[in-house]
Interface confidence: medium
């Protein structure tokens, strides 16, 4: 697994414990909370970082409508149980044997239960929509600059083929960033936009999971765009299942 | 590569405590759990606990709790088990083993040798 | 807790053999089974984990399947460094819990 040779840390993931471990005295690192071992030339799974993140000690408008099956992620924080590839199990339980099914970011897609509850596969999550609002500036930013600066930060920072990136919307404060990847689309290496979108989200929160890389530094024709929100939906390939007490 | 080496043969006798020790080599101490499993002569394999290495908190089996302790040195890569109270169904061979932090890396891919634990008067 | 029981306790094989060793919880685990090789003398090896991941260096003969609570171990063609005892073993929920171990024997 790649790392940086030189200190022997993790660039895309400062939540491992790196050693020259591997075949030849190579740097090798591993996630916090899992021991597992990871790949430092691409982003970690999320399930990792949470998994990590539960470990460390505590401290009718062109914007685009989500529809009645997005799921928004409110339950916060969970120490998840991940496959040996590192992603979400489709079934997660607690301590005090309450399980529930997620999706492939790892998002409750189902009410509670108990033990006998079956998850029967892990639902792709395929499309993603971030919800930004930015500080107030001395005028809007020009849509095609905000586009494109976006789009390169998604490919340079955490290594997304463009293809996935299918929209910027700008109606200011408002910024909507719609990731789209199906099951068959996304190819062998390719970064999850799962994986991305987690990252970007932490990013924005000041909480960069990059290895000593400066916080996120987002300018659009050298204005600072600085986010003070930041909401998440996602989208599943089969619709989730609530009853309709949750719903109401 | 990767090694777990434990402390040698004891003879007890019941009523004293026994502790084991388990040097890791070859990994990170801190990137993995430690646990600890016994094996009476002609048994199978019973869990005792393990110990979260990067937090240092352990866990124990019901059925140990109260006369088990799971410890660890980082400085020196070194995890513990010590058993007081000891009795003749005690004796066993006590094994160290890697494993990961969470329920899906409780597999145990590195083994130590083994320590045999005769408890007798 | 939960109780893993494996099926046969022990076993009469020949080399060139496919065998298969079965292994049944008593509540769901997921896919959080281990499969272990014992010889006589010597600490237990891992060979499957998660029910059906390969650990590295096992040969492929070995094979894992099963999810909830019914797990298999199969080797597709017994080689004479096989035969030995093997353990099951769920890590799914603390306490962790073996099987009582399948003994397999040169016929």
């Known amino acids: 697994h790649t790392a940086a040779q030189d200190n022997c840390t993790c660039p895309t993931n400062k939540m491992t414990v790196c050693s020259p471990d591997g075949p030849g005295g190579r740097c090798q690192c591993r996630a916090l909370g899992s021991g597992v071992a990871v790949d430092c030339s691409t982003l970690t799974s999320k399930c990792l970082l949470l998994k990590a993140r539960m470990s460390a000690p505590k401290n009718a408008r062109t914007l685009v409508r989500p529809n009645e099956h997005a799921l928004v992620d409110n339950d916060g924080l969970y120490d998840p149980d991940c496959d040996p590839e590192g992603r979400f199990k489709a079934r997660q339980c607690n301590q005090t044997s309450v399980c529930w099914c997620v999706n492939s970011v790892g998002v409750r897609r189902t009410d509670k239960g108990d033990l006998s509850l079956r998850c029967d596969e892990l639902v792709r999550t395929h499309h993603i929509l971030i919800d930004l609002r930015h500080r107030p500036t001395a005028g809007a930013f020009n849509h095609s600059d905000l586009d494109a600066e976006l789009r390169r930060l998604f490919r340079e920072r955490y290594r997304l083929h463009p293809k996935f990136v299918a929209a910027v919307h700008y109606e200011q404060p408002t910024i909507q960033i719609e990731l789209r990847q199906n099951t068959s689309q996304k190819a062998a290496g390719d970064v999850d936009i799962g994986d991305a979108a987690y990252y970007f989200e932490r990013d924005v929160k000041g909480e960069s999971l990059f290895q000593g890389r400066g916080g996120l530094d987002l300018r659009v024709r050298g204005e600072p765009l600085q986010v003070e929100r930041t909401l998440i939906y996602y989208l599943d390939e089969i619709p989730p299942k609530f009853s309709m007490k949750r719903l109401t | 590569q990767v090694q777990l080496v434990q402390s040698g043969a004891e003879v007890k006798k019941p009523g004293a405590s026994v502790k084991v020790s388990c040097k890791a080599s070859g990994y990170t101490f801190t990137t993995a759990g430690m646990q600890w499993v016994r094996q009476a002569p002609g048994q199978g394999l019973e869990w005792m606990g393990w110990i979260n290495t990067h937090s240092g908190v352990p866990k124990y089996a019901e059925d140990f709790k109260g006369r088990v302790t799971i410890s660890a040195d980082t400085s020196t890569s070194t995890a513990y088990l010590q058993l007081s109270s000891l009795k003749s169904e005690d004796t066993a061979v006590y094994y160290c083993a890697r494993s990961g932090f969470g329920s899906s890396y409780w597999y145990f891919d590195v083994w130590g040798q083994g320590t045999l634990v005769t408890v007798s008067s | 807790d939960i109780q893993m029981t494996q099926s046969p306790s022990s076993l009469s094989a020949s080399v060139g053999d496919r065998v298969t060793i079965t292994c049944k919880a008593s509540?769901?685990?997921?896919?959080?089974v281990a499969w272990y090789q014992q010889k006589p003398g010597k600490a237990p090896k891992l060979l499957i984990y998660s029910a059906s991941y390969r650990y590295t260096g096992v040969p492929s003969r070995f094979s894992g399947s099963g999810s909830g609570t019914d797990f298999t171990l199969t080797i597709s063609s017994l080689q004479p460094e096989d035969f030995a005892v093997y353990y099951c073993?769920?890590?799914?929920?603390?306490?962790?819990?073996f099987g009582q171990g399948t003994k397999l024997e040169i016929k």
């Open positions: 509540q769901d685990v997921s896919t959080a």
């Open positions: 073993q769920q890590h799914y929920i603390t306490p962790l819990t």
